[in-house]
């Protein structure tokens, strides 16, 4: 669909005569009839197949025709068509004299024709005007013409319909060839698909309008690239939605149980050493002079019973002082003035003289200790039970009650998860508190070394002299493909170059 436009510019009829040669009285009141039709090699009368149009009286004898497109659209003349423009045409322009006001053909005398021109040819759709001038013996007509597409029609022959829109069905304008040109922020065949915020995650985000990024369930953040952890997850993160992977030092399903109470809470006072001992629990090892669960209590210097051989301890500002019983002396009453003759050894201890009878030493029977065998042995004081085992005195002996997962006389052995040899392909098994772990040999992976993986035998760059390295997957060994001039399994040996010939 388009319009053939004809712009009449100037008509010259200096003598004011008709085609018959008869003069017009008083002058030739001139109007035009235009006929547009299909291309004919010889333009002949017949129907104006592309349309026709008449003008009012435009002037007398010779006159210029002013551009009157704004005031009623009479010049240029419009010949609309609603078919595909064929690219060729025939045009007939007749100038007529109007003696009266009635311009209908039947109202005019047959000899009222002033002049008639006919042209034919090719004409492409475009904005540029083609200027033409036709001259006869008595008249001259200057005019220009063009074919343009109607609104919303595009292309070389005005056959492509395109109507710009900005609604649910599309967001585009039309290009000169009739193709769609999406408005900024839209894409797709009909520009219906919004372009999301730059960086918006392809799978986890979407948008309903440009520069937007709406997150699918389980995702958050400006670009929907952060997963939402499980509801209630305290000290954990996620790599996919609704997970809770605990941060270092936290345990429990919701990572809310403190496995590193020592670091997070520093409960031990007065320089004591803190040891984590499970979820939310810890043990303080006090420095000398302190006691209590958190080593918060200062010990009296005498609480450690420093005075031996029955000496009595007295606290002093700068330490303590031992009052020794008869027969003993020294800072801790450790030296005796007694000899074996004084029977100083209790509980069946046997006395041995030392320093030519100047002193003695007691050899104590089992279950007794002290320089005079005066103390009963508490076999649990040395904390012999490992891994949190509980020490129990049983008369002359002792035993350890072990925590789950441990065994042995002193609970020193972890009940081995490795006993059933769970690691395949020669993997090495390690017992951990949380379970077991397999260290796999080269070429194997997986939790139990059950997956065979190919070794990159070329990783160590074993081939010399720019040779190409390949891994033989059947043997997991390297193969060197030598360049010209080198041999050997690693291409390390040069070969003799061919002799040079004198010609």
């Amino acid at each position: 669909s388009g319009v053939f436009q004809l712009q009449l510019q100037e008509f010259v009829n200096e003598r004011g005569v008709l085609a018959s040669g008869r003069p017009c009285e008083p002058g030739c009141r001139t109007f035009f009839r235009v006929c547009l039709k299909h291309f004919q090699a010889v333009v002949s009368p017949g129907p104006c197949t592309f349309g026709s149009v008449s003008t009012p009286v435009l002037g007398t004898n010779s006159f210029a025709v002013r551009d009157d497109s704004s005031g009623g659209g009479r010049n240029p003349l419009q010949l609309p068509f609603n078919f595909t423009w064929p690219g060729t045409f025939s045009l007939i322009i007749e100038a007529w004299h109007a003696p009266g006001d009635d311009l209908r053909p039947e109202a005019l005398p047959p000899d009222a024709l002033i002049s008639k021109i006919a042209i034919q040819g090719s004409l492409a759709v475009g904005q540029n005007w083609l200027l033409d001038e036709q001259t006869s013996t008595l008249t001259r007509l200057r005019y220009s013409y063009r074919v343009i597409c109607s609104d919303n029609y595009y292309g070389d022959n005005c056959s492509r319909l395109c109507k710009k829109r900005n609604d649910h069905f599309g967001h585009y304008v039309c290009q000169p060839d009739g193709n769609l040109s999406c408005l900024p922020g839209w894409t797709g065949e009909y520009c219906q698909q919004p372009i999301c915020l730059s960086g918006c995650h392809e799978q986890n985000g979407y948008c309903s309008k440009p520069a937007e990024c709406l997150c699918r369930p389980g995702w958050q953040g400006r670009l929907c690239n952060e997963c939402i952890p499980h509801n209630g997850c305290r000290h954990g993160t996620c790599s996919t939605p609704w997970q809770c992977t605990c941060d270092e030092g936290w345990g429990g399903l919701f990572c809310d149980q403190d496995l590193n109470y020592c670091t997070h809470h520093s409960p031990c006072k007065n320089g004591a050493t803190c040891s984590n001992s499970g979820q939310r629990s810890y043990t303080c090892t006090c420095r000398p002079g302190y006691t209590g669960v958190d080593c918060e209590l200062e010990l009296s210097e005498c609480d450690s019973n420093p005075c031996r051989n029955g000496g009595s301890c007295k606290d002093q500002e700068d330490g303590y002082h031992c009052l020794c019983p008869p027969g003993y002396y020294g800072l801790h009453c450790e030296h005796s003035t007694l000899s074996c003759a004084d029977s100083p050894c209790f509980n069946g201890g046997s006395c041995r003289e030392r320093n030519q009878g100047a002193s003695y030493a007691c050899e104590c029977p089992p279950n007794f200790t002290g320089s005079n065998c005066e103390k009963k042995v508490d076999r649990c004081t040395s904390n012999p039970c490992a891994n949190g085992g509980q020490c129990l005195n049983r008369g002359p002996s002792r035993m350890c009650r072990c925590r789950p997962g441990f065994t042995g006389t002193y609970c020193e052995r972890h009940v081995s998860d490795c006993a059933r040899n769970p690691c395949a392909h020669g993997g090495t098994c390690h017992d951990l508190e949380s379970g077991l772990m397999c260290t796999c040999p080269a070429g194997f992976s997986g939790r139990r070394c059950e997956v065979r993986t190919s070794i990159d035998a070329c990783a160590s760059s074993p081939c010399f002299n720019r040779a190409t390295c390949y891994t033989d997957l059947s043997t997991d060994t390297f193969v060197c493909n030598c360049p010209y001039g080198f041999v050997g399994s690693r291409c390390e040996f040069p070969v003799g170059l061919p002799p040079s010939f004198p010609w």
Epitope: Q243, G251, L253, P404, D417, S434, G435
Partner: nanobody
Framework: EVQLVESGGGLVQPGGSLRLSCAAS????????IGWFRQAPGKEPEEISC????????YYADSVKGRFTISRDNAKNTVYLQMNSLKPEDTAVYYC?????????????TGQGTQVTVSS
């Protein structure tokens, strides 16, 4: 595909008992710790109990200590939660979960849950 399916929930009177089961598939069962948590309407989820992959380490929340017992049968790929002396405040949806590792640290997969209602 990892799947955890809970069963055994229902309506029980205060003081009564229930035994919940969690049937697992899609992974090497005896490699993973399995735990139970519950969520009452409008409340945060609460961890109830967890058992390590070997079964040697078990954890119980203070609110259920002495009343609930967790156990696992590696041959049947199932974890059980025996709930005795039930109270109205135990009413919730009970979920089983695994951290995807041997120790009770985090949540990687959860089931769809089973409703437990304690009411007279």
């Amino acid at each position: 595909e990892v799947q955890l399916v809970e069963s055994g929930g229902g309506l029980v009177q205060p003081g009564g008992s229930l035994r919940l089961s969690c049937a697992a598939s899609g992974f090497t069962f005896d490699d993973y710790a399995i735990g139970w948590f519950r969520q009452a309407p409008g409340k945060e989820p609460e961890e109830i109990s967890c058992i390590s992959s070997s079964g040697g380490i078990t954890y119980y929340a203070d609110s259920v200590k002495g009343r609930f017992t967790i156990s696992r049968d590696n041959a049947k790929n199932t974890v059980y939660l025996q709930m005795n002396s039930l109270k109205p405040e135990d009413t919730a949806v009970y979920y089983c979960a695994t951290p995807g590792i041997a120790a009770c640290r985090g949540i990687h997969y959860t089931g769809q849950g089973t409703q437990v209602t304690v009411s007279s």
